[in-house]
């Protein structure tokens, strides 16, 4: 029961996480820049992985896509790649984990197969989460190192003087969504891996059985080529080949190491 709960919870957490990674990747607010001191209109500039937008206080918003790969930083391309890899791995992981769920019966699928599928999806979720966290962190680092401060003008009055000031380029909402989503996917993956251990069937110890012939005190010796009859050359009941069975004289009520395989 605990295994099913762990697996189910892991699946749900990962599902939420991957939905968050997709949302973060599509969002425009990866970075934001505020220019509130503009005397014309307050301009809110925000950028995503795929397009850049400018919103004015009047409500007018203009968004333009990055139609060229040239001129875009390699880091931005790397972030795009990491996020896409994270989504693809997560999606495959979700597909695999659906069939691995203990509560879902698909034909005569054995628990060992479900355990393997659970582990596979768990690993995929972990890698997916790490990709998202890495992508978001790389973008955040790019912001801090390259574009954290940007020069802009500040107008001291409607007809006043103009002076140059620094405006901050801050983390957008998408970064936080990405971090949280990546973390959830990672946690979900770990839960799936834990559930896998509970799903795997444990090895059973089977007791060895001695088979006795009905006549002439003949003991069947597995693996041996002769059976002792108690007569003839082997009158002292010497062991000819001990494959786990014994002659009647040797059979005792107490257990020995040969009783277990």
């Amino acid at each position: 029961m605990a295994v099913t709960a762990c697996q189910g919870l892991g699946f749900v957490v990962s599902l939420i996480g991957i939905a968050g990674i997709i949302a973060a990747t599509c969002m425009d607010q990866w970075s934001t820049q505020d220019l509130y001191n503009n005397p014309v209109t307050a301009v809110f500039n925000y950028q995503g992985l795929w397009r850049s937008c400018v919103r004015e206080s009047s409500g007018f918003t203009e968004c333009r896509g990055y139609f060229t790969l040239l001129g875009l930083p390699a880091m931005l391309q790397a972030v795009r790649a990491l996020m896409i890899v994270g989504i693809v791995l997560g999606a495959i992981g979700l597909l695999v984990s659906i069939f691995a769920l203990k509560c879902i019966r698909i034909g005569s699928m054995e628990d060992s197969a479900k355990a393997n599928m659970t582990l596979t999806s768990g690993i995929m979720f972990i890698v997916s989460g790490l990709c998202a966290i890495a992508g978001v962190s790389v973008f955040a680092n790019m912001l801090v190192t390259n574009f954290w401060m940007s020069t802009a003008n500040m107008y001291t009055g409607m007809g006043g003087m103009v002076q140059t000031v620094q405006t901050r380029y801050t983390f957008g909402a998408a970064l936080f969504v990405g971090w949280v989503a990546g973390g959830l996917t990672l946690i979900g993956g770990v839960m799936m891996c834990i559930a896998c251990r509970g799903l795997a069937p444990e090895e059973t110890n089977y007791k060895a059985v001695s088979y006795h012939a009905s006549g002439h005190s003949v003991a069947y010796k597995p693996g041996g080529f002769k059976a002792s009859t108690g007569f003839g050359s082997n009158t002292k009941n010497k062991k000819i080949y001990d494959g786990g069975a014994r002659t009647e004289d040797e059979v005792q009520s107490y257990p020995s190491k040969h009783d277990y395989v």
């Epitope: 014309v40 209109t41 950028q47 850049s52 400018v54 009047s58 333009r64 990055y66 802009a152």
Partner: nanobody, 121 residues
């Protein structure tokens, strides 16, 4: 980079009119706000008028009712129609644009080289 080139300045009599133009060129991604700023001889920079891409415009009190700002978004060009010019309007007029050369770049300020407007009889 974004380049701004002003034109239309010159000598005009008080009460006369003049039309300034500012053409933006280069690797322009977005120009949300364009403004005119002037610098009278021996004085600091003074903001005159500005217009956003959405059409919001604003004017300094000293030019309200006399100056009209407009822009052609398709040509990335800013205009300033100056009527009823006074001697105190004599200054070098600079075009200023808050623009980004690439989408992932923050909005930055770009300036023209300026055009001289002299109001004298």
């Amino acid at each position: 980079q974004v380049q701004l080139v002003e034109s239309g300045g010159g000598l005009v009599q008080p009460g006369g009119s003049l039309r300034l133009s500012c053409a933006a060129s280069g690797s322009i991604f977005s120009i949300p706000v364009m403004t005119w700023v002037r610098q009278a001889p021996g004085k600091g920079l003074e903001w005159v008028a500005g217009i956003s891409k959405g059409g919001t415009s604003n004017y300094a009190d000293s030019v309200k009712g006399r100056f009209t700002i407009s822009r052609d978004n398709s040509k990335n060009t800013l205009y300033l129609q100056m009527n009823s010019l006074r001697a105190e309007d004599t200054a070098v007029y600079y075009c200023n644009a808050q623009a980004s050369s690439f989408g992932w770049m923050p909005l930055s300020d770009y300036w023209g080289q300026g055009t001289l407007v002299t109001v004298s009889s």
